[in-house]
Amino acid sequence: GSERTCCPVNWVEHERSCYWFSRSGKAWADADNYCRLEDAHLVVVTSWEEQKFVQHHIGPVNTWMGLHDQNGPWKWVDGTDYETGFKNWRPEQPDDWYGHGLGGGEDCAHFTDDGRWNDDVCQRPYRWVCETELDKASQEPPLL
């Protein structure tokens, strides 16, 4: 595999990670796929410092992150442990609200206008943030 030592064009470096901030909206799954095709993942927030960095760049706009509970428990897309990790939910969130009338509950997490987190319907077209770590060998599978 090859090692990424600097961030791609149009990405922002911060604390040995690269971040890319969309300026348009997609459903959570489509945003997730977009990041994967960039050899990245939806942003995983592991500290208050990283929260403030992301919040500064996205402004007061609903923005997807790499956290969901579509299969039951809350999970970060990169495998970071949810239970012991950083959290910044709004009061009384997540609430898996069913009252939106769109069917089902709320299984995907996003930054709200004040930066704190809320769970929402995964189909909503929110902006998103991709993240990839520097100095991490990219997975290049062997050819068949």
């Epitope: 595999g1 090859s2 791609p8 149009n10 969309s22 300026r23 348009s24 909206g25 997609k26 459903a27 489509d30 796929n33 977009y34 994967r36 095709l37 960039e38 050899d39 077209p125 902006r127 998103w128 990219s138 997975q139 290049e140 599978p141």
Partner: antibody, heavy 122, light 108 residues
Framework: EVQLLESGGGLVQPGGSLRLSCAAS????????MSWVRQAPGKGLEWVSV????????FYGDSVKGRFTISRDNSKNTLYLQMNSLRAEDTAIYYC???????????????WGQGTMVTVSS | DIQMTQSPSSLSASVGDRVNITCRAS??????LNWYQQKAGKAPNLLIY???NLQSGVPSRFSGSGSGTDFTLTISSLQPEDFATYYC??????????FGQGTKVEIK
């Protein structure tokens, strides 16, 4: 000059296999996701598969999932499509295409190869 | 998957005519819409990306518009080299990218 050149097409019997190649030049191959798109004779365009720049992430259209495998060798600037369990309905021109992304989060296939014909027939 | 429907499927026009091709998405795709031109026996060629942005080298007689589910490709003054098949493609829900069935522009 940015260029994509496919090869490996031909006539194959139903149930058979074929491996297509796409040689890239004129751009930093490993920095771009690459895709295969096909076109059956006299028909429209159908997206087949895509692979991220490192090769670590792959996606497939429903009609080929489980039968086709996309891969790449960045040291050779080459994209591959391994096609197994071929069916008559896989008969098409297969194009490789470079995926370009734009500032705000959209993408498009901005460079296409000339295509290679795959015919599945007994 | 999001379905893309183009109309008309074919049209006849003369050099100098203004031509409109429409594309409708089965769900809102914001402005994640691309247009391609394909000449007989050739590979497709990107014309317009993200609804209205002209790909480098594409003549200014081509333009795109629309938002949500309804989009239009306009050729302001048809030229001989514009006789081809045109495809729209959504990149909102991608993968899978999906294309319209194509619109063939023929000489009247």
């Amino acid at each position: 000059e940015v260029q994509l050149l496919e090869s490996g097409g031909g006539l194959v019997q139903p149930g058979g296999s074929l491996r297509l190649s796409c040689a890239a030049s004129g751009f930093t191959f490993s920095s771009y996701a690459m895709s295969w798109v096909r076109q059956a004779p006299g028909k429209g365009l159908e997206w087949v598969s895509v692979i991220s720049g490192s090769g670590g992430n792959t996606f497939y259209g429903d009609s080929v999932k489980g039968r086709f495998t996309i891969s790449r060798d960045n040291s050779k600037n080459t994209l591959y499509l391994q096609m197994n369990s071929l069916r008559a309905e896989d008969t098409a021109i297969y194009y490789c295409a470079k995926r370009e992304t734009y500032d705000w989060g959209s993408d498009a296939f901005d460079i296409w190869g000339q295509g290679t014909m795959v015919t599945v027939s007994s | 998957d999001i379905q893309m429907t183009q109309s008309p499927s074919s049209l006849s026009a003369s050099v100098g005519d203004r031509v409109n091709i429409t594309c409708r998405a089965s769900h809102s795709i914001s402005n994640y819409l691309n247009w391609y031109q394909q000449k007989a026996g050739k590979a497709p060629n990107l014309l317009i990306y993200t609804t209205l942005n002209l790909q480098s080298g594409v003549p200014s007689r081509f333009s795109g518009s629309g938002s949500g589910t309804d989009f239009t490709l306009t050729i302001s003054s048809l030229q001989p080299e514009d006789f081809a098949t045109y495809y729209c493609q959504q990149s909102y829900s991608s993968p899978p990218w999906t294309f319209g069935q194509g619109t063939k522009v023929e000489i009247k």
